[in-house]
Each structure stands twice: as C-alpha cells, then as structure tokens.
Amino acid sequence: HQDKVPCKMVDKKVSCQVLGLLQVPSVLPPDTETLDLSGNQLRSILASPLGFYTALRHLDLSTNEISFLQPGAFQALTHLEHLSLAHNRLAMATALSAGGLGPLPRVTSLDLSGNSLYSGLLERLLGEAPSLHTLSLAENSLTRLTRHTFRDMPALEQLDLHSNVLMDIEDGAFEGLPRLTHLNLSRNSLTCISDFSLQQLRVLDLSCNSIEAFQTASQPQAEFQLTWLDLRENKLLHFPDLAALPRLIYLNLSNNLIRLPTGPPQDSKGIHAPSEGWSALPLSAPSGNASGRPLSQLLNLDLSYNEIELIPDSFLEHLTSLCFLNLSRNCLRTFEARRLGSLPCLMLLDLSHNALETLELGARALGSLRTLLLQGNALRDLPPYTFANLASLQRLNLQGNRVSPCGGPDEPGPSGCVAFSGITSLRSLSLVDNEIELLRAGAFLHTPLTELDLSSNPGLEVATGALGGLEASLEVLALQGNGLMVLQVDLPCFICLKRLNLAENRLSHLPAWTQAVSLEVLDLRNNSFSLLPGSAMGGLETSLRRLYLQGNPLSCCGNGWLAAQLHQGRVDVDATQDLICRFSSQEEVSLSHVRPEDCEKGGLKNINL
C-alpha cells in the first residue's frame, strides 16, 4: 500500500520530493538509509523527527526554506555520509544559533551551495568534519577566504567555490587541507594568482574571473601535481608561466586577451618583459624541475577566442603529447607546422575563424592529425599537396575560404589549386562557400570520402566525372544553393549514398533510379521540379524515408508516384498538408487532395495512377 502515500519508498530509499511538506514526516520506515526531502517548504530542521531516522546515510534537504537548524539536529544521525542543504536560507541568523551544523563525524560530502553565505558566517556554520571529502560552497556570497575558513577538515579532497564574489584568498587559506585535489574557483572576482603553491592539487578551475596574471610559487624543488587547469574567460594578456606544472594534461585559456611573443625573450634569466608579449612562455623548465620539458604531457590545449596573431615555432616544439589544439577565433594570418615530428600526436587542430591566408604543413608533420578545421578563413593559393601530406587526415572543413580544387592526376588544374585526390584517409570534406567555379574531373579520385559538402558555391559547374571514384564510398552529398540547372553526376551509381541535398538550385530533372539504392533522405526544396515520374524514382521506393519538396512548381497531374507516396505514408514527405501543386489552369491545391478524376476532367489522363 506504500505507493499511495506521498513519499515513494523503494528498499531503504525514501523520496519525498516536492510535496509541499512543512516538516520532516514522523512515519517513514525507521531503517531508511536515503531520504530525499528536496523541493519542499521546510523552514526549520529539528532533532525530532529528523533524529528518528538513525540509519540515514544520504539526506537531501536542498531547495527548501530552511533558516533554522536546531542545535544537534544531525547529532543522532551517526551514519550520515552525504548531506545536502543546498538552496536554502542558511544565511539568516537563526540558522547559526549555537554552533551551526555541529560535528559531522562520518559525513563525506556536504553541499551548502546557494545559501547566500558570507565569509564570517561560514566559519560559524562549519563544524568539525573529519571525514569530509567533498564540500560545495558554490553560489554563495563569499568575498574572501582566510586561514580559519577551512579548519577541522583534514580529509577534504574536492572543494567547489564557483559563483561567489571572491576577491581575496589569504595566504595559507588552503593550508589546512593537505589532501585537496580538486578546487573550483570559477565565476568569482579574482584578479591575480601570484603565488600558486598547492602542490597536491590536480584539478583547478579558475574560469570566468578577471585574472590578469597566473604565477606559480617560486619553489625550485616543488613537485606540482596539477593535471587540469581552466583559465578560460579571464583577462590574461600573456601565456602564463607553466614551467612548474610538468604534469599538466588539460589547459583551457580560451576567451582571454592573449598574444604570443613574436621574437625570442630579451634576457637570459627567463623573466620576460610583458611589453614583449612574454610571461615566461613555457620554453624552458626551471632548473630544479625533474621533467625538463614543460607542457610535454599536455593533451588538450584551448587557446580559442584570444588575440594571437602568430604562433612561434618554439611554442609548438615541446607539445609532443598534444592531441587537441584549438586556436579558433584568433587573428592568425599564417600557420606553419613544417618540422619533422612537429605535433606528432595531434589528432584535432581547430584553426577556424581566423584570418589565415597561408598554411604550410610539412610533409611529415602532424602525422596523427585526423580532424582539421579551417572554416571561416581567407585561404586561397595553397601549395597543392597541403592536405595530401597529412597521412591520417579524416575530416577537413574548409567552409568559407577561397580554395580551388585541382582535377585528377590527368587534369591537374590551374596554379594555386589544391589537390583532394589521393588522400586515402580522408572521409569528410566541406568546401561550402569557396566560390568554386569548376569542379574538375577526377577531383576526388582515390579519396574514399563518405561525406562531401559543396554547397553555397553559386555558379558551380560540375564537370562530368568530377565525383568519379566516390561511387562506392559516398554516403552524404550536399550541393545546396549552387544554382545548378543540370546535374552532371550519375547519382544512381552512388550505391552507398544515404543523404542527398540538392535544395536551392534550378533543377527540373533527376537521373532515373531504376535499381534499388541506399538513399534515405532526398532534399529537393526550392528547385524547378514539376514532375517526379515513377520511372525515374522507382528505385528509391525501398530505401527512401524522407523527401523534401517545398518550393517546387509541382504539377497536380502526372505526379502519380508522388501521390502514391503521400497516400501510403511510407515516405515522410515534408509539410504534407502544405505541399501545393498546380493544374494547367494555374489553380493551386494541396497535392494530397488531388483525385484521379480531377486530372481526367481536363483531358489530362493520370498515367501513373
């Protein structure tokens, strides 16, 4: 019968979420181990009845209106391990009478986020918590941390302080937390990290502050454990000095004001003048550091949304483990990776939305690169084998450039064209909006693409055989918005083609699909089709799932194949109700309403019906 009471009970878990409760129920099973009272209207937490449930391990009191904690309210809960008081009103003075939370001997995680707690008050609220591993103080009103803020928490490993208004962290504020490994200080008001000395810390989130400088403490023998550092959305002017952080694996510096130096440092001591754009760029490790090569373990580096105009050769030199590099939304005009073994592990390189005009990739550089994003640049005359040299390249996005593809080996094409043939690893290529005028025969020979997007190249001429060699591999082809009147592509030969986008052209005929193919989605919107005869479309009947036809001058008569699809409902034809067709009298009606006799009346026999 317990399914009919307000709280849901399964095993030893009781959920009383969002029931409008004003107090903790007295009638729950006495051996309850997990109790969720979130989203109610509890205003005070009293030892009775909460203390009735002495077996509790997990207690969720979040999103209530709690402003009063009776002294010793949690005292009887000797097994309590997880306590959430998030999103309550603990900042009101009554919450703190006689010792706040009191001792929490076995609690390992405590969530006090969203309580408008301010600095002095927090110290009165937090009691002894010798087992505490995880503490969230996010979304409060803390302005400073002192060496008294976190006391009696020797086991604390994860501390979340995001979304406060922290401006000041006193020296030694975290000294009493010898096991702290994860620290989230994002969305605060910090302006400078001048003496980072938390050697045991592994994860540090400093995103969304106003940090202008990040400096590690000058401890020559220090062995910093930091592997994950997030400094995105700050006000860094220079790449920070990270030579003391040899274990760094993830580094996010996006959305700053970073410029990289254009020349070598001016002095020999490794302290560089900010006017030169240097902040001890990670080119040499401190003498006492065992690693010898800073950032040599870095796997992920995000420098997007900065003001970088140039990447010095030396900058990439030590990034021997890097797998993901994001340099999008900067001011790069050129990018070079010419050296043998440069960025040997890099799998993804995002250079999109810069001002790139030149790109020089050495014959044996970037040997692991799988994804190269170059959309939104100004690339024009590239060395012909720029991409053919990338032995592992699978995905290439060149949208919004001015790249002209060469033809096949027999028809190389003009100077400045780029070869896309013979790239045996390439699977996905976007050449959208490149002002391509002519796609030459054999352009993709021996490049087994599965996805090719040639959309938004108005006036594109597709030469016979331009897509030759793709018949056995291509699954997605987009030719949208090219003004094509005739399609010089023998589409029925593309046996793997699943999605075909021919929208926004001027096509009025399609080749005949007489044999069964794989096509599932066909987009013909905004073309000049009046008829889709069954003789041409018959081969699609087994595979086609979606057909888009809006914006075509469809004829009401002679479209029996299409009418049959509408009535059978096997193919999802877009906007069925609004698919308009015209009689010879120019009268417009919904195609789904046309009957055979409507066509016979005017002497137009519907041959397909």
């Epitope: 009471v5 004003l22 129920p25 009638v27 099973p29 006495p30 009775s48 009845p49």
Partner: antibody, heavy 116, light 107 residues
C-alpha cells in the same frame, strides 16, 4: 503473511512489573515501527509509544515515560513492553501494532489485570 | 499534544444508510490522519491511512476526506458487518493521539 503474536494474559499485584512480548513474522522487522497501544475496559485507544527495531530508539507518550520501557530484539523479531510499578488503573488490554503511515497489522492483545 | 475530537460519540443507523463520522484536530495535521474499525472483543483494524487511502482489502464503500484540522470518514451504504466502533488517529506529530471513538449501532 504478516503476523504479530503477543504473550498471554497476566494477573499482577500492585507495585509489581509485567513484560509483554510481541513476536513478528512475515515481513522485514526493521523496516516498520512497532507501536504499543492501551485500551482500558470500555475505553478508547491510547498510544503508549513506539520503537525503531533497527536502532532500538524508542519514543514515548509523556504520560507513560516513567512507567514503560519498550525494547526490541532484532535476532528474534520480537518487541517487548515492560510496565513497572503497576496500579489498578493499568488494568487494560495492551496491543502491539506495526506501522509507518498507519498501524496496518495488530497483535491479538494481551490482557493485564492488576489486582491485590 | 494534539487533541482529536471525534463526533458523534455514538450513532444509530440502518443497513443501506450513508453515514459520516468527523474528526477535528486541535492543530493542522497535514493529512496524516488514519481511521480504524474495532469490533467487540477484537483488535482494531486499519481502514484508511493518510486521510483518504484505503488499506488493502477494505471495501470501497469506505472513504475518507479532509485537510488541515477537519477530517471525515464516510460509509456510503451501511452493511451489517459495519456496525462497530470507529477511531481516528493523527500521526503528524508525536505523541500520536486517537479520537475518543464513535460507536455505530443498528437502529
């Protein structure tokens, strides 16, 4: 099926003590409160108190706090109520009943007669 | 302690009648109200818990309603086996307390 079986009727002298037992079966003993209820002859029902069998924590009606001790033995799934310093007004039928939201199963009752 | 005032204390009715028993708490008990039936010589039996939820096996002619301080037990069509004493009980706040009972007799 759920069953609560209470010990037999008792006749006691004033000032003495009595311990009534209630053996539970057919459910998880520790998952329900065990309540004790008094019914004097021709009278209504009076809640004495309850115990959480898992922890042994008991709650009493103020009126019975000094006279009654409720205990439970998890190993035998048995609850006990001990009445001390018996007086004639303690003559009644005493019921054990399991229950969280409602007392859904009751023992058959134990009649305790206090007489000199 | 929360006082539970039950009325009427006794009631005569005939088979087939519709009968209503009320229970008033001295303060809001948030629907934590139960109804019990007791026949002579027997232990009480739970009929309804949490104001309106029928205990398993209880006939649907029994129903409960109410909120705040005022609660009602209704028997829509009295059957011969329904003649007994009925008690309400609040379980919102310790100590749990019973009403004084309503004795339902054959007219």
């Amino acid at each position: 099926q759920v069953q609560l079986v209470q010990s037999g009727a008792e006749v006691k002298k004033p000032g003495s003590s009595v311990k009534v037992s209630c053996k539970a079966s057919g459910y998880i003993f520790t998952s329900y409160w065990m309540h004790w209820v008094k019914q004097a002859p021709g009278q209504g029902l009076e809640w004495i108190g309850r115990i959480a069998p898992n922890s042994g924590g008991a709650h009493y009606h103020e009126k019975f706090k000094t006279k009654v001790t409720i205990t439970a033995d998890k190993s035998t799934s048995t609850a006990y109520m001990e009445f001390s310093s018996l007086r004639s007004e303690d003559t009644a039928v005493y019921y054990c009943a399991r229950g969280n939201y409602g007392m859904d199963y009751w023992g058959q009752g134990t009649a305790v007669t206090v007489s000199s | 302690d929360i006082q539970m005032t039950q009325s009427p204390s006794s009631l005569s009715a005939s088979v087939g009648d519709r009968v209503t028993i009320t229970c008033r708490a001295s303060q809001d008990i948030s629907n934590y109200l139960n109804w019990y039936q007791q026949k002579p010589g027997g232990a009480p039996e739970l009929l309804i818990y949490y104001t309106s939820t029928l205990h398993s096996g209880v006939p649907s002619r029994f129903s409960g309603s109410g909120s705040g301080t005022d609660y009602t037990l209704t028997i829509s069509s009295l059957q011969p086996e329904d003649f007994a004493t009925y008690f309400c009980q609040q379980v919102n706040t310790l100590p749990f307390t019973f009403g004084s009972g309503t004795k339902l007799e054959i007219k």
